[in-house]
C-alpha cells in the first residue's frame, strides 16, 4: 500500500540540538519562520541519521500540547486548539487563522525506540499584514540565502554594466526578468509553502494500527489533502523510517 507524505523541508532547514547525549539522530526543522496574521503556516520537523523507530510525535507551543501523532492510533488534536490546528502534512502540523498571540516557540518531540526523545525547535513570528508584505527583517534561512545570491548577481550585473555601457538596458532587463522567475520558483519550495504537486515520499511500511480515513488515498496536492482529511478524526500519521 502506498503512503504519501507531503514533506515541506528543503535546503533551508536547520538542525536542532538533541534532547540527550548518545543518540545519533538529528532533528531538522524549518527554523525561524514568519507568517502573516490571518494566514496559515506549516510546522515541519524531520528526524534523520538514525534507524530508530518513531513511535510518536508531540507538538507543543511553549508548555501547551497542540497535537499528538501516534504510530498506532493516528492524530489527536487538543480540543483547546481544534479550530485552528490541522494535522499534516506528514508528521507536521498546520496552524490556521494565525494571530499575533501565536508568535513564539514551537517544539516537535519525537519519541523513538530505542534512541529515546529528540526535540526540535521552531520560532514563529506572526506579522501584521503590512509588515509581512513589506518587511524582510525576519526571513527563513532559504530566503536569506536567496537574498545573498541576489546581491552577488546584482553586483556582477553592475560590474558588467560599467564595462559595457552600450548593452546596459538589454542586460538589466534580461537579468531582472530572470531573477523574478527564479524568486517565484524558490518561494514555492520555502518551508512555509506546500510542496509542489507530486512530491511524495512512499513510506517503507504502513504502521499496523492506523484508523484514518486516508488509507487508500493517492498522493494529492496539499489543498486536496486537507479537503479529504477530517482533521479531528484519527487520520494517519505517515510514520516511516526517517533516515537522512
Amino acid at each position: 500500500m502506498r503512503w504519501c507524505l507531503l514533506l515541506i523541508w528543503a535546503q533551508g532547514l536547520r538542525q536542532a540540538p538533541l534532547a540527550s547525549g548518545m543518540m545519533t539522530g538529528t532533528i531538522e526543522t524549518t527554523g525561524n519562520i514568519s507568517a502573516e496574521k490571518g494566514g496559515s503556516i506549516i510546522l515541519q520537523c524531520h528526524l534523520s541519521s538514525t534507524t530508530a523507530q518513531v513511535t510518536q510525535v508531540n507538538w507543543e507551543q511553549q508548555d501547551q500540547l497542540l497535537a499528538i501523532c501516534n504510530a498506532d492510533l493516528g492524530w489527536h488534536i487538543s480540543p483547546s486548539f481544534k479550530d485552528r490546528v490541522a494535522p499534516g502534512p506528514g508528521l507536521g502540523l498546520t496552524l490556521q487563522s494565525l494571530t499575533v498571540n501565536d508568535t513564539g516557540e514551537y517544539f516537535c518531540i519525537y519519541h523513538t525506540y530505542p534512541d529515546g526523545t529528540y526535540t526540535g525547535r521552531i520560532f514563529l513570528e506572526v506579522l501584521e499584514s503590512s509588515v509581512a508584505e513589506h518587511g524582510a527583517r525576519f526571513q527563513i534561512p532559504l530566503l536569506g540565502a536567496m537574498a545573498a545570491t541576489l546581491v552577488v548577481i546584482c553586483t556582477a550585473v553592475i560590474v558588467v554594466v560599467a564595462l559595457t555601457r552600450k548593452k546596459k538596458a538589454l542586460r538589466i532587463h534580461s537579468v531582472e526578468g530572470d531573477l523574478r522567475r527564479k524568486s517565484a520558483g524558490q518561494e514555492e519550495w520555502s518551508p512555509s509553502a506546500p510542496s509542489p504537486p507530486g512530491s511524495c515520499v512512499q513510506a517503507e511500511a504502513a504502521p499496523a494500527g492506523l484508523c484514518g480515513e486516508q488509507r487508500g488515498e493517492d498522493c494529492a496536492e496539499l489543498h486536496d489533502y486537507f479537503n479529504v482529511l477530517s482533521y479531528r478524526s484519527l487520520g494517519n500519521c505517515s510514520f516511516f523510517t526517517e533516515t537522512g
Epitope: Q56, L65, L73, H76, P79, S233, L234
Partner: antibody
Framework: QVQLQQSGAELVRPGTSVKMSCKAA????????IGWVKQRPGHGLEWIGD????????NYNEKFKGKATLTADTSSSTAYMYLSSLTSEDSAIYYC?????????????WGQGTSVTVSS | DIQMTQSPSSLSASLGERVSLTCRAS??????LSWLQQKPDGTIKRLIY???TLGSGVPKRFSGSRSGSDYSLTISSLESEDFADYYC?????????FGAGTKLELK
C-alpha cells in the same frame, strides 16, 4: 481485553486527602488519555480532567483546579487522582475512562468506579 | 462551558417498545457526542460515539442521529437489559460536559 480496574471504596475525614488509582490492562497505557469523572446523586456526571501518560500532559476542569491532581505511573500502567482538603461535597463515585482522539477511542472504556465518602 | 440539555429526565416503556432520548448542545460540538449507559450497579458503557457510530459489541437496536444541535439515541425494540440510566457526553471542547441523564424504567 481492555480493562480499567479502580481502587476500593474510601471512607475519609473532612479536611484530609485521598488518592485513588485506575490500573489499565489490555492495551498500551502510554497511548491513551485517562479521564476522570465525578458522579454525585442529583448532580449527574462531571468531568474533572484527563492525563496523557505518554507525555505527562494534563487538562483540568477549572472547577476542580486545586482540588484534583492527576498523575500516572507508566511502569505499573496506573493512573492516579489525588483529592485534597476533602469536604462532604467531595463524597461521590469517581470513574476513570480511557480516550484518544475523537472517534473510535473517545471515552470508550470505563472503570467500575471508586466510592469516596467524606464523613466525621 | 457547553451545556447539554437532555430529555426526558425519566421514561417508562414496555419491552419491545421503541424509545428515543434527546440531547441539545448549547454550542456547536461538530458531532463529537457519545451516548453512555449506566447500569444499576454503576457500570458505565459507551454505546455510541461521534453522534451516530455504534460502539464495539453494542447491539444494533441502539442507534444515534443528529439534526443540527439536537442529538438522539434510539432503541428500536427494548429488551430487559436496556433499563438503565443514559447520558450524553460532548467531547468537542474542554471541559467535557454531560447531559443530566435519562432514567429508563420498565412500565
Amino acid at each position: 481485553q481492555v480493562q480499567l480496574q479502580q481502587s476500593g471504596a474510601e471512607l475519609v475525614r473532612p479536611g484530609t486527602s485521598v488518592k485513588m488509582s485506575c490500573k489499565a490492562a489490555g492495551y498500551t497505557f502510554t497511548n491513551h488519555w485517562i479521564g476522570w469523572v465525578k458522579q454525585r446523586p442529583g448532580h449527574g456526571l462531571e468531568w474533572i480532567g484527563d492525563i496523557y501518560p505518554g507525555g505527562g500532559y494534563t487538562n483540568y476542569n477549572e472547577k476542580f483546579k486545586g482540588k484534583a491532581t492527576l498523575t500516572a505511573d507508566t511502569s505499573s500502567s496506573t493512573a492516579y487522582m489525588y483529592l485534597s482538603s476533602l469536604t462532604s461535597e467531595d463524597s461521590a463515585i469517581y470513574y476513570c475512562a480511557r480516550s484518544y482522539g475523537y472517534d473510535l477511542y473517545a471515552m470508550d472504556y470505563w472503570g467500575q468506579g471508586t466510592s469516596v465518602t467524606v464523613s466525621s | 462551558d457547553i451545556q447539554m440539555t437532555q430529555s426526558p429526565s425519566s421514561l417508562s416503556a414496555s419491552l419491545g417498545e421503541r424509545v428515543s432520548l434527546t440531547c441539545r448542545a448549547s454550542q456547536e460540538i461538530s458531532g463529537y457526542l457519545s451516548w453512555l449507559q449506566q447500569k444499576p450497579d454503576g457500570t458505565i458503557k459507551r454505546l455510541i460515539y461521534a453522534a451516530s457510530t455504534l460502539g464495539s459489541g453494542v447491539p444494533k437496536r441502539f442507534s444515534g442521529s443528529r439534526s443540527g444541535s439536537d442529538y438522539s439515541l434510539t432503541i428500536s425494540s427494548l429488551e430487559s437489559e436496556d433499563f438503565a440510566d443514559y447520558y450524553c457526553l460532548q467531547y468537542d471542547s474542554y471541559p467535557f460536559t454531560f447531559g443530566a441523564g435519562t432514567k429508563l424504567e420498565l412500565k
